[in-house]
Structures are given as structure tokens and as C-alpha cells.
């Protein structure tokens, strides 16, 4: 016997499907409609045979009941090759629901999405999340997709993009997003953080995560955010391999006064990189290579500092006293 | 273990300069700052200011930014205090104070574990 | 630049007797202050760091406690020994570093 597709937990909070067969059978999706959060994998399936059995143009008003009695509010959906035209159709209905959290992994997209019907209503997410999708359109996919979303998008995060860099020109301003996640996207480097980060695009960016995203300095960083006028009050980049020395030729760049939180773990530093910001409420250098303890000037001011799992702090090596550069915390870095 | 040894007591007369050398063993003198404090006599402790023994870059507290160098020399283990164009004002017992790094769970600092025994300076005419 | 006060200017305690040094900063230091020693002829010695840390080989009668702006250093038991000159020292995460005037530990 093969296990039931879908599987909804005792609260009938979350609802999990799982469609591996090659001719899975869609309507047992239908017991996730309790649901709140709903994941949904399609196993790697094409869904373009979908299309003859959809009229993807229908007026998607004749459904609004229905899905506005939907509880779900988290959805997501993976592991499948997905023409534009259904996705569209598929945004169109959700435009009803009470949908906030949108996660797409490991999807295609294929063909062009089409623009926004003048008396469609938009997507009203407040989160949407991103990882290892890829678009037939390339860099105008964010623009394309944008029109089907209302402008209060508070969280987008892309990950594993096949084209991190947007089309600025045809990219509307998220003037709601206050938290911005391009992380998992190594061949970002500082030059596709500058194509990314479309200047004037995301005035109200407040947490700006780039992990592992081959980012190469601090100052590298501070020269796109300014170059974008992207004034985070957080920022993480950690899991990048960060050098420590800048380049003297390149000039000084003055980070923004709101920046107050700064993560530099996991970033492999053997020292504390010169030209952080002189003042910072949270600074994170822990799991790094630091072998010394950092002298007075070479620390900003931090009201909370972090500097576990450096080998000059670790148990074992030398120390003048006790108690004195020990924490007593090892992390496991 | 570690020691800080100051250069003998100076009598300098008033206009001339002194460089008061303090030689560290027993760590590796790049890895702490070393700090410079004046007392002059019966009077308290006063902080001068600190370099950095990695990059050799000094800092000086706002009463000690003229007249006053801070300077070192790596491959001696010595850190030295330079007093140009002396006035009377400067003689005191001038100290040598090493910085040692205090981290424990967000919480960070510096403290003064090893000092000279101090190097008096005597202006007089 | 912050300034640290020390009081009383002058302590008389007899051997035995607890003694209880203050320190005020002008402005929030956090745990940032250090205890100092100094005896006649001698260089000044560590007792007490980030407030409340005694200092390898300080004897326990010694303690630190405060945060923010007052500190306290507190000798239980005063020895022969401890008659001296004692100064806190703001070490606030960056310079500048102050010292306060000292608090002078004298016989009874």
C-alpha cells in the first residue's frame, strides 16, 4: 500500500503533502483546506499537462468564497516545474484567501508571466520566501512577479537564485520591506549585491541577512549599501570568508549611523576587520580565527559583544590568569 | 613570567627632552597594548593614553596630545615615552602599565595586570 | 571624558574593622571599573576588575560589587598590609580611561 499524499497533524494546524507518483491524485490536497500552514511537494513533477485541466482565465471572483474561507496562512510549494500562466492563475485565487506567507523552493518557471489584469486584485503577503527557483523571463522575473503582490511585502528572501540581480528599471519600490534575505547565493560577491540591491527600491529596509553570499569585506559591503541608499539597522554576514585588511587603494566608507547589529560569524577572520562602525549595539565575531585578544582601538564601542569559539578564548591555550579572556562558553563552531 | 623593567630615574632640566624605555618579558609583547600613566608627587594616577603594540599607533588622553610620543620597538620588547621642551609640570614617577583583554559573555573590557616599577622624572634647573 | 569620584578622601579604619571604599562615575560604565592598590614607593597593583572580579592571588577579604555609575570595594578584615592608597579606574569599553583621586586607607 502506498502512504496516503497528505498528512494533517491532530490541531489541524499543519497539513504536509508529498505527491512522488507520476499520476498523483490532486484532490487529496483537498484535506489541507482546515489547514493553517500547508506544505505541498510535487515530487519534481511538470505541471504544464495541468493547464488543459485548468482554465487559467477564468474569473477567478467565482471562487472568492470559498478560498476566502480558507484558514490557511502559510503555504508552501515545492519540487516542481510550473508554467507562468498557472502560477498567475494560482496567485489570482490566493488574491482572495488570507494567505501572508508564501514559500516557493526548487521550482522552474516556465514561459512569461502576464501582466496584471486592471481589475485583478494583488496578493496581500507579508512574507515571501524564495529558494532555488529559476525563471524563464531571467532578470525581469521579480518585476513580473511584484505586480501580482499588494505593496505591503514585509519579508522577501532569495535564495540559490539562478539571477540574484534584478532589472532595477522595471522593478517597483517595496516601500513596506523591512527585512531583506539574499542569502545562500555565493556567487553573489559584492558587485551582484550592488545589481541587487536596486537603489531606492527598499527605502525601508531594516534587516538585511547576505550569509554565505561570497561577500569579501566589511567596507566592500558598506561601499553597495551606501551606492543603494539601503540603510539597515541589522546586518548578517556571516558564512562568508571575510578579509580582514582593506584594499588602501579603495576609498573609506562611512557606515550608516543606523546600522546597530552587525554578524561577522563564521567568516573565518584572523583579526577584527579594520573599518566597522565606530558604535554598535550587537556585534557578533564568534567561531572565528581570532588567535589574539583585540587591542582598544581595533574594537568598535559594543554594548554586546560576542567572541565565543575564537581559538585566543578557547580552554587549553595559555593564559596570563585565570578568568581573564575565558568565557567559559564553547560554542560548537 | 611577565615583567615590565623601566629605564632609571631621569634629571632633566627644564626645555630638554627624556624617552623613558619600558622593556617587556615573559608574552609576547605584540599581543597586549601598553599604556603610560602619570603621577606626579602626592598626587593620584593619571592616564596618558596607550598604543597599539600590533600596529604601533598611539592614542593620547586630551591632556598629553602635545610634548608626549608614544613609540616602540618590536624586536626589543620595549615600549618608549618621549617628553619634549620639559617643563616643571611634567616631573613625576611615570609608569608603564600593560592592557590585558577581559571578555565573558557579552560583557568586554581592559584592565591594568602588569606595570613598571616606574621611572621618576625630575625637572629642575 | 567621564569622572570618577572617590570617597571618602581619607579612611581611618582600625586592624580587623571592614572597610568601604565608594566611587561614583559621571556616566553609565556599566561593569567597566577596576580596583588599584598602591603603596608608598610602589607601583600600583590590580585587586578588583570589571567590578567585581578579584585578580589572581588577591586575597578574598578583598570584594567589588556596583554597576552602572556607583562601585563599592569592600575589605572585610583589614590587615597591616592593607594600608594604602586605593583607586577605581574606569576602563569603559574604549578610551579614554580616567582614574579617580584615590581613597587613602590610614590606622585608626
Known amino acids: 500500500t502506498t502512504p496516503e499524499p497528505c498528512e494533517l497533524d491532530d490541531e489541524d494546524f499543519r497539513c504536509v503533502c508529498n505527491f512522488s507518483e507520476p499520476q498523483p491524485d490532486w484532490s487529496e490536497a483537498f484535506q489541507c483546506v482546515s489547514a493553517v500552514e500547508v506544505e505541498i511537494h510535487a515530487g519534481g513533477l511538470n505541471l504544464e499537462p495541468f493547464l488543459k485541466r485548468v482554465d487559467a482565465d477564468a474569473d477567478p471572483r467565482q471562487y472568492a468564497d470559498t478560498v476566502k474561507a480558507l484558514r490557511v496562512r502559510r503555504l508552501t510549494v515545492g519540487a516542481a516545474q510550473v508554467p507562468a500562466q498557472l502560477l498567475v492563475g494560482a496567485l489570482r485565487v490566493l488574491a482572495y484567501s488570507r494567505l501572508k506567507e508564501l514559500t516557493l523552493e526548487d521550482l522552474k518557471i516556465t514561459g512569461t508571466m502576464p501582466p496584471l489584469p486592471l481589475e485583478a486584485t494583488g496578493l496581500a503577503l507579508s512574507s515571501l520566501r524564495l529558494r532555488n527557483v529559476s525563471w524563464a523571463t531571467g532578470r525581469s522575473w521579480l518585476a513580473e512577479l511584484q505586480q501580482w503582490l499588494k505593496p505591503g511585502l514585509k519579508v522577501l528572501s532569495i535564495a540559490q537564485a539562478h539571477s540574484p540581480a534584478f532589472s532595477c528599471e522595471q522593478v517597483r519600490a517595496f516601500p513596506a520591506l523591512t527585512s531583506l534575505d539574499l542569502s545562500d547565493n555565493p556567487g553573489l560577491g559584492e558587485r551582484g549585491l550592488m545589481a541587487a540591491l536596486c537603489p531606492h527600491k527598499f527605502p525601508a529596509i531594516q534587516n538585511l541577512a547576505l550569509r554565505n553570499t561570497g561577500m569579501e569585506t566589511p567596507t566592500g559591503v558598506c561601499a553597495a549599501l551606501a551606492a543603494a541608499g539601503v540603510q539597515p539597522h541589522s546586518l548578517d554576514l556571516s558564512h562568508n570568508s571575510l578579509r580582514a585588511t582593506v584594499n588602501p587603494s579603495a576609498p573609506r566608507c562611512m557606515w550608516s549611523s543606523a546600522l546597530n547589529s552587525l554578524n561577522l560569524s563564521f567568516a573565518g577572520l584572523e583579526q577584527v576587520p579594520k573599518g566597522l562602525p565606530a558604535k554598535l549595539r550587537v556585534l557578533d565575531l564568534s567561531c572565528n580565527r581570532l588567535n589574539r585578544a583585540p587591542q582598544p582601538d581595533e574594537l568598535p564601542e559594543v554594548d554586546n559583544l560576542t567572541l565565543d569559539g575564537n581559538p585566543f578564548l578557547v580552554p587549553g591555550t595559555a593564559l596570563p590568569h585565570e578568568g581573564s579572556m575565558n568565557s567559559g562558553v564553547v560554542p560548537a563552531c | 613570567q611577565v615583567q615590565l623593567v623601566q629605564s632609571g630615574h631621569e634629571v632633566k632640566q627644564p626645555g630638554a627632552s627624556v624617552k623613558v624605555s619600558c622593556k617587556a618579558s615573559?608574552?609576547?609583547?605584540?599581543?597586549?597594548?601598553m599604556n603610560w600613566v602619570k603621577q606626579a608627587p602626592g598626587q593620584g594616577l593619571e592616564w596618558m593614553g596607550w598604543i597599539n603594540t600590533q600596529t604601533g599607533k598611539p592614542t593620547y588622553a586630551d591632556d598629553f596630545k602635545q610634548r608626549f610620543v608614544f613609540s616602540m620597538d618590536t624586536s626589543a620588547s620595549t615600549a618608549y615615552l618621549q617628553i619634549s621642551s620639559l617643563k616643571a609640570e611634567d616631573m613625576a614617577m611615570y609608569y608603564c602599565?600593560?592592557?590585558?583583554?577581559?571578555?565573558?559573555?557579552?560583557?568586554?573590557?581592559?584592565?591594568?595586570?602588569?606595570w613598571g616599577q616606574g621611572t621618576m622624572v625630575t625637572v629642575s634647573s | 571624558e567621564i569622572v570618577m569620584t572617590q570617597s571618602p578622601a581619607t579612611l581611618s579604619v582600625s586592624p580587623g574593622e571592614r572597610a568601604t571604599l565608594s566611587c561614583k562615575a559621571s556616566q553609565n560604565v556599566g561593569s567597566n571599573v577596576d580596583w588599584y592598590q598602591q603603596k608608598p614607593g610602589q607601583a600600583p597593583r590590580l585587586l578588583i576588575y570589571?567590578?567585581?572580579n578579584r585578580y589572581t592571588g588577591i586575597p578574598a577579604r578583598f570584594s567589588g560589587s556596583g554597576s552602572g555609575t556607583e562601585f563599592t570595594l569592600t575589605i572585610s578584615s583589614l590587615q597591616s598590609e592593607d594600608f594604602a592608597v586605593y583607586y577605581c579606574?574606569?576602563?569603559?569599553?574604549?578610551?579614554?580611561?580616567?582614574f579617580g583621586q584615590g581613597t587613602k586607607v590610614e590606622i585608626k
Open positions: 570589571k567590578a567585581s
Open positions: 602599565a600593560r592592557s590585558t583583554f577581559y571578555y565573558s559573555s557579552y560583557i568586554y573590557g581592559w584592565y591594568f595586570d602588569f
Open positions: 579606574m574606569q576602563s569603559n569599553t574604549n578610551p579614554p580611561w580616567t
Open positions: 615573559g608574552y609576547s609583547f605584540t599581543d597586549y597594548a
